[in-house]
């Protein structure tokens, strides 16, 4: 049986059940290389409490559809000797990066995971030439996830004192110059994740090979190498390489751009201080508030919730968007879709799409930006589920009793963007990270 998601085959992936202190290793095409789980384990559970390993999915007993992968075992999941066997079930959804498998829950018999990934899309529009896993768990099983930094088009310009060259990088994947052919990037070779521009020429100085690594709790490292043997004439016989170190700052701060810290014989060392390098619980919440010791800030958007069936309305030329954030109030137009953001076509009001659901909510505060994300909406033709990204700005004089109102700013590949000026986005900082 052919591997269902070949792009995901090159790596052993990790997921964590934080509640029970369990680390899962997943290899969807072969077997994980963990002796204690046996030679054919595709999903190996490492119980850190008891320091034991259990195979909860066998690579030989794999069954697959386009959106579901199941690994059975021969292990009875209760002690009564019935036919039920321990198994793992991975549900795949279309995403814009390779993404990460997320542990959902585990019953007595089944360990459930969900994975939003380009590998599950119906079309190839989000697929990279080369992409590597862009997250890591530290020794405390806390997740550090750089997926939000990945650019689907364009690149980051590295801060460098050299006026004759410009170094552009992407995070964990190659630079897509076709979708956003900026004048400087147009000459970058396909597959490069680190592109050096000198005058009108552009050179590949690194491609992603290995996934993100953690070197210390708050330092993550990504390495790019130039795959072809051909040397560049200005590298003194050395093969180019790029090392990017992502540093979680010691306290809350605005974002910075990547900085070149060392350069020698086409070996580039870059340091990037960004809160995305911090563990995810420091940045994100599933509710509409971020507060407490862990986050160093107090944010509460719950006063923006609308009651009594009313919604915020944002005009998007062809469409009207109805928004009801931070609550579970059904939007009248949206036909019981559990939508937090509802898209209605002006010319045909029967065309209604959920652009994100209220139980699929993430509030994120990172590098000085406050964002509320609703995902899991109705599918587009690519298979990607519509989502909405609301970028908040602090405005102490906002109208509507300080609440302000969302403004639609555009759509890219079924992701809808809004800005929202409100006094409730004014962040209160603590200082003990």
């Amino acid at each position: 049986q052919a591997a269902p998601f070949p792009e995901l085959c090159s790596y052993t992936w990790e997921a964590v059940d934080t509640k029970n202190n369990v680390l899962y290793k997943i290899n969807i095409c072969g077997s994980v290389d963990i002796v204690q789980c046996g030679p054919s384990s595709a999903v190996c559970m490492h119980d850190l409490k008891t320091r034991t390993y259990h195979s909860v999915g066998d690579s030989v007993l794999r069954s697959a559809t386009r959106s579901l992968l199941e690994f059975n075992t021969t292990v009875s999941c209760d002690q009564q000797g019935t036919n039920h066997r321990v198994q793992s079930s991975i549900a795949f959804l279309c995403g814009k990066t390779l993404g990460t498998p997320e542990f959902v829950t585990a019953t007595e018999c089944v360990h459930y995971f969900e994975w939003r990934t380009t590998a599950a899309c119906k079309k190839d529009i989000f697929k990279a030439n080369k992409e590597v896993p862009c997250y890591v768990f530290d020794e405390e099983l806390r997740k550090h996830d750089l997926n939000p930094l990945i650019k689907l088009s364009g690149a980051y310009l590295v801060d460098d004192s050299d006026p004759d060259t410009s170094l552009f990088i992407n995070v964990c994947r190659d630079i897509d110059t076709l979708r956003d052919p900026g004048s400087q990037l147009r000459a970058c070779p396909p597959g490069t994740a680190a592109c050096l521009v000198r005058g009108h020429q552009a050179f590949d100085v690194g491609q992603p090979r290995d996934g993100l690594k953690v070197v210390r709790k708050d330092r993550l490292v990504l390495s790019y190498v130039r795959e072809e043997a051909g040397k560049l004439d200005f590298c003194d016989g050395h093969s180019p390489a790029v090392t990017i170190t992502f540093v979680c700052p010691s306290e809350r701060r605005e974002g910075t751009i990547p900085k070149l810290t060392a350069k020698s014989n086409c070996r580039y060392e870059i340091e990037w201080i960004t809160e995305y390098a911090c563990h995810r619980d420091y940045l994100e919440s599933k509710t509409c508030s971020l507060s407490g010791e862990q986050q160093d800030v107090s944010i509460d958007l719950t006063p923006l919730a609308q009651s009594g069936g009313s919604s915020y309305i944002s005009d998007g030329k062809e469409y009207l968007f109805y928004l009801n954030v931070c609550g579970e109030t059904e939007i009248q137009f949206c036909n019981k879709k559990q939508a937090a953001v509802c898209q209605v076509k002006k010319s045909d009001t029967s065309q209604v799409k959920a652009a994100g659901r209220y139980h699929n909510q993430t509030l994120r505060y990172s590098d000085g930006f406050l964002t509320l994300i609703y995902f899991g909406g109705d599918e587009c033709s690519s298979g990607f589920q519509r989502m909405s990204v609301i970028n908040f700005e602090c405005n102490k004089t906002a109208g509507n009793d300080g609440k302000g109102t969302p403004v639609f700013t555009g759509e890219v590949d079924c992701t809808y963007f809004f800005t929202w000026d409100t006094e409730y986005a004014c962040v209160h900082h603590h200082h003990h990270h």
């Epitope: 509640k19 029970n20 585990a106």
Partner: nanobody
């Protein structure tokens, strides 16, 4: 106050059965994973079985197929049903509760002796 109390131990003949209980107080029981451990005289404490907060169960190879862990959230109690007991199962049995927000909590232990 957070507390675990084991009971149900005793003297049993080889091949016999026992059911140990571990009653919890002062914690949201259903949010915790529960583990049974045992310590035989002169030996290190060893893990026996786990019942995770979500419901999955795992067992040490030495007890697989003989022991069953279960819980009753209404009674805040976790059980260890032990069948086909062997002399090498003789030990003090401890239960442990753990969650991301609490330090591990141990009970005082209950003695199980398997002897003819």
């Amino acid at each position: 106050q957070v507390q675990l109390q084991e009971s149900g131990g005793g003297l049993v003949q080889p091949g016999g059965s026992l059911r140990l209980s571990c009653a919890a107080s002062g914690i949201i029981f259903s949010d915790n994973r529960m583990d049974w451990y045992r310590q035989a005289p002169g030996k290190q404490r060893e893990w026996v079985a786990t019942l995770a907060s979500y419901g999955w169960k795992t067992y040490a190879d030495s007890v697989k197929g003989r022991f069953t862990i279960s819980r009753d959230n209404t009674k805040n109690t976790v059980y260890l049903r032990m069948n086909s007991l062997k002399p090498e199962d003789t030990a003090v049995y401890y239960c442990k509760a753990s969650s991301p927000v609490l330090n591990d909590i141990w009970g005082q232990g209950t003695q199980v002796t398997v002897s003819s």
